[in-house]
């Protein structure tokens, strides 16, 4: 009989991000003896699960096992066999499942139960599947980017995202855009966080952080589009919706039942004299922008200042990393460069939205039409959210850095989530030999 193989001097962790539109599996790796050092964990693999988000399996839970198979098998290939049983697996579900839970706690529990049973069938150290809160999503995204940028380290950072910035220990704010929610998280400058729900206190590597965070449910790009359609169809004279957020010549039939399926459109729901309507694109950035602004209620603020919908937002402070769909959309539109001013971004969006649909399809032949058709809306929405929603200005725009990866690791909440659950972010600054520690995020 063989003895149990000595583990490699590295460890692995798996986090599944069960988002509203899709699920991604991330594999992380780190040297076993440097668990408490900052910046040692890095991503070795991302596997995008084929299909929609897990909330869409509510009527077909028996298919969840098959849905997860390919990426879980990929994890088995990437991680050495001798490490499988020691590798923790976490699944965090975000706003798509939050919305399902709002509709039916029982259905959300059923989906999570099947997900748990499916994942526990693999030879990993499965640690559970849960719906993370919007506050957690914001906090873990903030931890991820600052960990990867070396902001928690007292030593000189080994990677600088901003060429002009060398060893600034000021943390970056985090801007995360998903399909169903969006998060804003940063350390305000000497500002009292007026609403306790938006305040987080961390002690990380011997330093205290007072962090502001808020997650806007229903303001992810997909749910924002549903909201906008539900709002606009209210005033349509017939079953034709002339929509400035889609390219001229674009046509798409929408079922009213699909439109009202999400809790995000409940406030706009009304009895319509038709069961379907047709979107007809007219491609006008300015009108699209105006329509989007109607989703943000800025008339009411019980605090010194608000973002929208009466949610407290302190004055913006420092640099921000904008990731997930902020990055994917702006990358597609070729607008991620540090050199592109806000005015230039707006100008390019005007041109892009005005391009005829047939022309767009030809120019981007390799892109799925469903995604391609929504870039005009998504780009306009990002501008509206950042400028009118979060109060960035033409001047402060240059403090937004659209980030996909930092040193090969995706920006997003998953790394921060794993660092926390594996107790790899000590409250105190570790000595050269890691201390035993008990206080974590």
């Amino acid at each position: 009989t063989q003895n149990k193989a000595l583990p490699e001097n590295v460890k692995y962790g798996i986090v599944l991000d069960a988002g509203s539109s899709h699920t991604s599996l991330y594999i992380y790796k780190w040297p076993a003896e440097k668990e408490n050092d900052t910046g040692v964990v890095h991503q070795v693999e991302e596997c995008r699960v084929k299909g929609p988000g897990i909330s869409k399996f509510v009527q077909k839970v028996n298919e969840i096992g098959i849905y997860l198979t390919d990426c879980m098998e990929r994890a088995r290939e990437v991680i050495p066999r001798s490490q499988h049983q020691e590798t923790p697996v976490y699944l965090g579900a975000t706003a798509g499942m939050r919305l399902l839970r709002m509709e039916s706690e029982e259905l959300a529990d059923r989906v999570l139960d099947v997900v748990e049973r499916s994942l526990s069938n693999y030879p990993f150290d499965f640690q559970g599947a849960r719906i993370i809160t919007g506050q957690e999503e914001g906090a873990y995204g903030w931890i991820t980017i600052n960990y990867l940028l070396g902001k928690f380290s007292q030593k000189t950072r080994w990677f600088s995202i901003v060429p002009y910035e060398t060893n600034n220990q000021e943390t970056f704010g985090a801007l995360d855009l998903g399909g169903a929610s969006t998060q804003v998280t940063f350390v305000p400058q000497n500002q009292t966080i007026e609403s306790p729900d938006n305040a987080l206190q961390f002690r990380l590597y011997g330093k205290d952080y007072n962090v502001y965070t808020h997650s806007f449910l229903c303001y992810g790009k997909d749910q924002a589009l549903w909201q906008k359609l539900a709002k606009d169809i209210q005033v349509a004279s017939n079953e034709i919706l002339r929509d400035p957020c889609f390219h001229p010549g674009y046509k798409k039939v929408v079922n009213v039942s699909d439109l009202y399926k999400t809790p995000c459109t409940k406030r706009f729901e009304m009895t319509l004299p038709f069961q379907q309507f047709e979107i007809q694109g007219i491609g006008n950035y300015q009108q699209c922008h105006q329509s989007i602004l109607e989703l943000f209620n800025t008339s009411y603020c019980p605090y010194s200042q608000c973002a929208f919908n009466g949610i407290f937002l302190p004055p913006l402070q420092g640099d921000f990393g904008a990731f997930s769909a902020f990055y994917f959309v702006m990358k597609f539109l070729n607008l991620t460069s540090e050199k592109v001013s806000q005015e230039k971004v707006t100008e390019m969006m005007k041109k892009f939205c005005a391009q005829p649909w047939e022309e767009i399809k030809t120019s981007y032949a390799g892109v799925k039409e469903k995604y391609l058709s929504e870039y005009c809306f998504s780009g306009t929405y990002i501008l509206s959210l950042l400028l009118q929603g979060y109060h960035f200005t033409a001047d402060s725009w240059e403090h937004i850095h659209f980030i996909g990866k930092i040193q090969g690791s995706d920006a997003g909440w998953t790394l921060g989530y794993m660092l926390n659950l594996t107790n790899m972010i000590p409250a105190e600054q570790p000595l050269s030999t890691p201390l035993s520690h008990s206080t974590y995020v």
Partner: antibody
Framework: EVQLVESGGGLVKPGGSMRLSCAAS????????MNWVRQSPGKGLEWVAE??????????HYAESVKGRFTISRDDSKNTVYLQMNSLKTEDTAVYYC????????????WGQGTTVTVSS | EIVLTQSPATLSLSPGERATLSCRAS??????LHWYQQKPGQAPRLLIY???QSISGIPARFSGSGSGTDFTLTISSLEPEDFAVYYC?????????FGGGTKLEIK
């Protein structure tokens, strides 16, 4: 010496219950997944159940044929794994082996000598 | 569930001959296939793990090969003590399953 010793087998009527025990020695019991495998008279081998570690919340898995009737459990302080068998059927008659894998997973490099369970009226 | 089909059900050979036992999986299981030997009245004994990995203490005449769905256990030159029943086992996914066995008997 690495050893697994099963006990608790015997004769039981259909519908009855029985609890098998397996005492482990010679290795760090709490670090290894434990399994039960059975063999009906003159037949092949059939995996019955698996139990994982405390860190895995003692996760269990079962063959479809025993799900809902059999329960695997472990007591790490006693280095013992159990198989509680309820609603026994004649087709559960078999030699029950306690097994584990001391290297990697999902194969069995350590076996007990087996304990015979006979379900008959 | 992964179904393993072993062939032949019985193999009659003489000592000194080469034995080739086959195991086919109903779907790809990479190299997660293990081989056991069982003699009457005894518990099975692991011979080969992960399709081709040898076990210390098992004679070198036992070797395994294959990947995906088709696997082979080869005994290069049969010794009298090798006559027994051989089982393959799916170690890829739950439920763990065994093949029906190949009985290797003296001709």
């Amino acid at each position: 010496e690495v050893q697994l010793v099963e006990s608790g087998g015997g004769l039981v009527k259909p519908g009855g219950s029985m609890r098998l025990s397996c005492a482990a020695s010679g290795f760090t019991f709490s670090k290894y997944w434990m399994n039960w495998v059975r063999q009906s008279p003159g037949k092949g081998l059939e995996w019955v159940a698996e139990i994982r570690l405390k860190s895995n919340k003692y996760g269990t898995h079962y063959a479809e044929s025993v799900k809902g009737r059999f329960t695997i459990s472990r007591d790490d302080s006693k280095n013992t794994v159990y198989l509680q068998m309820n609603s026994l059927k004649t087709e559960d008659t078999a030699v029950y082996y306690c097994t584990t894998q001391l290297d990697l997973y999902w194969f069995f490099d350590v076996w007990g000598q087996g304990t015979t369970v006979t379900v008959s009226s | 569930e992964i179904v393993l089909t072993q062939s032949p059900a019985t193999l009659s050979l003489s000592p000194g001959e080469r034995a080739t036992l086959s195991c086919r999986a109903s779907q790809s299981i990479s190299d997660y296939l293990h081989w056991y030997q069982q003699k009457p009245g005894q518990a099975p004994r692991l011979l080969i793990y992960y399709a081709s990995q040898s076990i210390s203490g098992i004679p070198a005449r036992f070797s395994g090969s294959g990947s995906g769905t088709d696997f082979t256990l080869t005994i290069s030159s049969l010794e009298p003590e090798d006559f027994a029943v051989y089982y393959c086992q799916n170690g890829h996914s739950l439920p763990l399953t065994f093949g029906g066995g190949t009985k290797l008997e003296i001709k």
